[in-house]
Amino acid sequence: YTSTAQPCPYPMAPPNGHVSPVQAKYILKDSFSIFCETGYELLQGHLPLKSFTAVCQKDGSWDRPMPACSIVDCGPPDDLPSGRVEYITGPGVTTYKAVIQYSCEETFYTMKVNDGKYVCEADGFWTSSKGEKSLPVCEPVCGLSARTTGGRIYGGQKAKPGDFPWQVLILGGTTAAGALLYDNWVLTAAHAVYEQKHDASALDIRMGTLKRLSPHYTQAWSEAVFIHEGYTHDAGFDNDIALIKLNNKVVINSNITPICLPRKEAESFMRTDDIGTASGWGLTQRGFLARNLMYVDIPIVDHQKCTAAYEKPPYPRGSVTANMLCAGLESGGKDSCRGDSGGALVFLDSETERWFVGGIVSWGSMNCGEAGQYGVYTKVINYIPWIENIISDF
């Protein structure tokens, strides 16, 4: 008695697919595979397959059913923080070769990484013209201010809305200031946040307000405090710089905008007698913390002149280092003061028409605005590698 195995039904390729190998008939243990055209993928229902092979069984049936070759669907594109996405090919079209365009919210954000145009590729991922599968980035535009002209505020004037949108009020023990970098970092002075370095959550960070005591402000909380490793508390103010990482990104608007970091060419806008602007809620001439955000325009002072001013007692020799810059009037009267610490001394980059942080309010004479003495600021340009490393690492 002999029997021959029944041949299996001839495999009909699914639409947009083909069978291989093609045979006249398929008998016991013969197999075939299905390959889909570019832009189509093997699916068993909703489940994707990289490959498909069926084997002919002795009862003349295939051991598995035919899959489908379905057009690749990249799915709805991810939302872009501070941006939006537009369907170019057609409303809601997300299949192979469909095109979408990401864009950032105008005025306050600019697109980084690529041009925002993405295509649904055969691998099922939205892909930029540069081949990137990750989202573009909407980075806050820095250095925008309502002012068009170019810590410690003494002899200053009241700021108006949008003048210093990077200004941050730091409460937590004492009143201090800082400047917003990007949308989740604050640049400040090390001495202003030294006590909170191990208790970042104790810092109450406020922005988007002019009035120090106003209930209307944007609240931010600190995730971590990074103090420059070269800073020694109670032993001078060298390396008086710190970064605060916020636990959430803040929404950028005309009242909350980051300050720019100085470009390599920034020194050309920070020469002796160039005007910088310091802002804060520190002590005024009346001896009280300012209720309203104040600012003062002050010239950069020759470094040797400043060093000499702080060589005589009660200041120890070498108080002014190469990591500092000084600003103020020889005649006095205009200065930053206690409570302004950590705030930014900003300059207008006339090439980019953006404001950048040149200094951080650090220290000065006991009597603010004293003739022959100057406000001393951390020289930010010396710390760009340190700032960039911290921000990229964390």
Partner: antibody
Framework: DVQLQESGPGLVKPSQSLSLTCTVT?????????WSWIRQFLRNKLEWMGY???????SYNPSLKSRISITRDTSKNQFFLQLNSVTTEDTATYFC?????????WGQGTSVTVSS | DIVMTQSQKFMSTSVGDRVSVTCKAS??????VVWYQQKPGQSPKALIY???YRFSGVPDRFTGSGSGTDFTLTISNVQSEDLAEYLC?????????FGAGTKLELK
């Protein structure tokens, strides 16, 4: 033989994130198929949560889309579930699985309680 | 979402009987249905996929049939180890959805 094993904390506080790991042995998660997360509530109701495919593409249950993320570490042959803003309703036994295609394999499940 | 309805929560049977468990999809799912067996404290075990294809190692007393919206799992010669919960799953479209289950118990 293909084996899957779930791991992660058994207790999560409301509003926090639930994070689970599925370690796969006996088959590379990049070779083929879709690798799913499924959960079973106390009354035995099963819910498919989503998958990550061999290519790294994901598909999520729309009811969870705003809270769920499935990722993988191909070097460790692991895939992960993160479910944000959990409530007591997320208390369940969580399974990782390779469903249907090329054989059907499930982990033994890990019980997660959401409670303060 | 596609609703998979298993109208009978419980079914009583005896060893040696033939029993049919049914599952109805709220819309056409082709043949993209799996049948699972689950015992207390265990993960589900797949029996049938693509409506009628038996997974390897599954006894041939288990058979599946149906397409479109109506599906049946038949156990032709019930054994004591078959007393468990039986669930259907559609994997045709996102989201994959399970039936509520039918518990097979002794008369």
């Amino acid at each position: 033989d293909v084996q899957l094993q779930e791991s992660g904390p058994g207790l999560v506080k409301p509003s926090q994130s639930l994070s689970l790991t599925c370690t796969v042995t006996g088959y590379s998660i990049t070779s083929d198929y879709a690798w799913s997360w499924i959960r079973q509530f106390l009354r035995n109701k099963l819910e498919w949560m989503g998958y990550i495919s061999y290519s790294g593409r994901t598909s999520y249950n729309p009811s969870l889309k705003s809270r769920i993320s499935i990722t993988r570490d191909t070097s460790k042959n692991q895939f992960f579930l993160q479910l944000n803003s959990v409530t007591t309703e997320d208390t369940a036994t969580y399974f990782c699985a390779r469903l249907i295609t090329g054989g059907d394999y499930w982990g033994q499940g890990t019980s997660v309680t959401v409670s303060s | 979402d596609i609703v998979m309805t298993q109208s009978q929560k419980f079914m009583s049977t005896s060893v040696g009987d033939r029993v049919s468990v049914t599952c109805k999809a709220s819309q056409n799912v082709g043949i993209n249905v799996v049948w699972y067996q689950q015992k207390p404290g265990q993960s589900p075990k797949a029996l049938i996929y693509s409506a009628s294809y038996r997974f390897s190692g599954v006894p041939d007393r288990f058979t599946g049939s149906g397409s479109g919206t109506d599906f049946t799992l038949t156990i032709s010669n019930v054994q004591s180890e078959d007393l468990a919960e039986y669930l259907c799953l559609q994997y045709d479209i996102n989201p994959l959805t399970f039936g509520a289950g039918t518990k097979l118990e002794l008369k």
